[in-house]
């Protein structure tokens, strides 16, 4: 026995345009409520045949007026668990109707009016015991998002909840064969109290009050051999009462898996391990496709429109996993060096650089010479917040790596004319003035402010910047 | 206290059937979820898994060996036996048997050979 | 079948050094049959680590495991002399239930 527990996230438009009208209206105000129907195994019966595993209804949510003008938000929901409680064995692999209700509030004569809004529907596989499974399910323009889980009542435990729990008789351990319950370390395993006279030898149970059969044995209390023989081979001193057992097949013989699952014998049982596209058991379920919109989070999903094929999610930026199940969280790669803070928007990655850094990931240090090469001679200059390369004469730009027009500040005085040179630059002074950049006037007497003209220059020809 | 002992010919000849008992005590064969497997080792080399019964009469074998593997028990008076039909050298080894018990796993029920006995060397030889 | 790979066969290890040994699944294993055994010369093998990281009982706390699907290690914080031995891991999840061919661990 158990409880197969419900949590509706959130219901609403779905993605993409058409986004349906709200239900409710400031002139029929309503509330909305769920129902779940369960059925064991992966029926695919009509909703309307009954829910064999169980059903149930949730209370009624908060009303809910729409605003005029306003997108149909995601609507107000009922609180707590829709919870279904199964009186016998979890069958692990189940199919699953929810219905979301609309209960409108106006004056209608006779009391509240009820429509349905949506329905969704699926098959799954789901271990009890097991953690909180999530889903997201499409009906027309609706999106519903659910989380959903079974568990077992104690004393049951295990996957199907048919293993038994009691408290412990002793202090320190449990009886021969009976092991913990976990997570009730306290209790132990009780033995299944199988059907009356069931053989202890040949026959098991799963719950209470059955008698299964082993291989080779049949009958109510498997009891009876599925053949016997003359013993040619005796089988040990056990069978000397039985008479010979023909020994039964093997679990694999005669390959229980459907669909092209490959079988394997396991301890106690056997293994299917299923083609693409298939699982359950006996590879008996066809897979999840896009239909059943499994992606999270705004991934798309391609392929998958057949059962044989499986699908894709392409997450959307900030999402990862199988289904686009897990946010990514990419600040924890630490993608903002020299003590840049991350902000992960979700859409994009931001870094806010510290005083000094630039860059889209702060990786530029302005104030730092280090690495910063001048070309052509120049000499790098820090401060202000910034690098500069102070230039060699003849080149400029940021890294000195442009060649400069070195006339274009003129630099001959007292109206000299400035000639460019592969070298450098070229005064040619005025009359009256001499010196590299025609700095200096020649005085009336013929002598220069200067000491002596180098040889082969007279005072009044162009100076050549050395 | 679990202890197991096999037994065994010691030596036989190629082509003849090699019968080993395990007899074992400090647990039943009558007990949900308890088993008695085989292993072999040949001398300097690695184990080698033949066959297991549970308590409830299922059996597995290696499907390698199939053909030529029995494996019965005697609830009552503890005790395992294995048989290989058709013996050459390469069956030449040390054979162990071993509990299986069940052990607690993540999901479902799960088994480890828990306790071994001391191995019982066989030879096979002409 | 799944064939179990363990490395490296041989290795050799200071008093007091960290040691890992890796056994790797041809295909995927649950990790709740996958076990380690330690055998010792002229003895039994005996259960040291079950469902992949549980000691058994009397192995010391310096062992551990862990691993999942094709890959399990087995490591020792700090060898110590009875440690030496050779480790087989042991796959109990599908017929033919197989172990590796061993890791021997000696003392340097």
């Known amino acids: 026995a158990g409880v197969f527990e419900l949590q509706i996230h959130s219901f609403g438009p779905g993605p993409g345009p058409g986004a349906p009208r709200s239900p409710c209206s400031a002139r029929l105000p309503c509330r909305l409520f769920f129902r779940v129907c369960l059925k064991p195994g992966l029926s695919e019966e009509a909703a309307e045949s009954p829910c064999a595993l169980g059903a149930a209804l949730s209370a009624r949510g908060p009303v809910y007026t729409e605003q005029p003008g306003a997108p149909a938000p995601d609507l107000p929901l009922p609180d707590g668990l829709l919870q279904v409680p199964f009186r016998d064995a979890w069958p692990g692999t189940f199919s699953f109707i929810i219905e979301t209700w609309r209960e409108e509030l106006g004056d209608q004569i006779g009391g509240p009016a009820w429509s349905l809004l949506a329905r969704v529907a699926g098959r799954r596989r789901l271990a009890a015991g097991g953690p909180w499974a999530r889903d997201i399910q499409r009906a027309g323009a609706w999106e519903l998002r659910f989380s959903y889980r079974a568990r077992c009542e104690p004393p049951a435990v295990g996957t199907a909840c048919t293993r038994l729990c009691r408290p412990r008789s002793a202090p320190s351990r449990c009886g021969p064969g009976l092991r913990p319950c976990a997570p009730l370390e306290d209790e132990c395993e009780a033995p299944l109290v199988c059907r009356a006279g069931c053989s202890p030898e040949h026959g098991f149970c799963e719950q209470p009050g059955e008698c299964r059969c082993l291989e080779g044995w049949t009958g109510p209390l498997c009891t009876v051999p599925v053949s016997t023989s003359s013993c040619l081979s005796p089988r040990g001193p056990s069978s000397a009462t039985t008479g010979c057992l023909v020994p039964g097949p093997g679990p694999c013989d005669g390959n229980p898996c459907a669909n092209g699952g490959s079988c394997s014998e396991t301890p106690r049982s056997f293994e299917c391990t299923c083609p693409r596209g298939f699982y359950g058991l006996r590879c008996e379920v066809s897979g999840v496709t896009c239909a059943d919109g499994p992606c999270f989070n705004g991934g798309l999903c391609v392929g998958g429109a057949d059962p044989d094929s499986a699908y894709i999610c392409h997450c959307p930026p900030g999402f990862q996993g199988s289904n686009c199940e897990k946010r990514v969280d990419r600040c924890s790669l630490q993608p903002c060096r020299n003590g840049g803070l991350c902000l992960d928007l979700g859409h994009a990655l931001r870094c806010r650089c510290r005083a000094g850094f630039a860059g889209p990931r702060c990786e530029h240090d302005l104030d730092d010479c280090a690495g910063r090469a001048c070309a052509n001679g120049g000499t790098c200059v820090e401060g202000g917040g910034a690098h500069r390369c102070s230039c060699a004469l003849g080149f400029g730009g940021r890294d000195c790596r442009e060649r400069a027009d070195p006339c274009a500040a003129r630099p001959c005085a007292h109206g000299g004319r400035c000639y460019a040179h592969f070298s450098g630059l070229v005064c040619a002074c005025a009359p009256g003035y001499m010196g590299a950049r025609c700095e200096f006037p020649v005085h009336p007497d013929g002598a220069s402010a200067l000491p002596a003209a180098p040889p082969g220059l007279r005072p009044g020809d162009p100076q050549r910047y050395l | 206290q679990v202890t197991l002992k096999e037994s065994g010919p010691g030596i036989l000849q190629p082509s003849q059937t090699l019968s080993l008992t395990c007899s074992f005590s400090?647990?039943?064969?009558?007990?949900?979820?308890?088993?008695v497997g085989w292993i072999r080792q040949p001398s300097g080399k690695g184990l080698e898994w033949l066959a297991l019964i549970w308590w409830d009469d299922v059996k597995r074998y290696h499907p390698a060996l199939k053909s030529r593997l029995t494996i019965s028990k005697d609830t009552s008076s503890s005790q395992v036996f294995l048989k290989i039909a058709s013996v050459d050298t390469a069956d030449t080894a040390t054979y162990y048997c071993?509990?299986?018990?069940?052990?607690?796993?993540?999901?479902?029920?799960?088994?480890?050979?828990?306790?071994w006995g001391q191995g019982t060397s066989v030879t096979v030889s002409s | 079948q799944t064939v179990l790979t363990q490395s490296p066969a041989i290795m050799s290890a200071s008093l007091g050094e960290r040691v890992t040994m890796t056994c790797t699944a041809s295909?995927?294993?649950?990790?709740?049959?996958l076990h380690w055994y330690q055998q010792k010369p002229g003895s039994s093998p005996k259960l040291w680590i079950y469902t992949t990281s549980n000691l058994a009982s009397g192995v010391p706390a310096r062992f551990s495991g862990s691993g999942s699907g094709t890959s399990y290690s087995l490591t020792i914080s700090s060898m110590e002399a009875e440690d030496a031995a050779t480790y087989y891991c042991?796959?109990?999840?599908?017929?033919?239930?197989?172990f590796g061919s061993g890791t021997k661990l000696e003392i340097k």
């Open positions: 400090g647990f039943s064969l009558s007990t949900s979820g308890m088993g």
């Open positions: 042991h796959q109990f999840h599908r017929s033919p239930f197989t």
């Open positions: 295909s995927s294993v649950n990790s709740s049959s």
């Open positions: 071993a509990r299986i018990a069940e052990v607690t796993g993540q999901v479902g029920l799960h088994y480890a050979m828990d306790y």
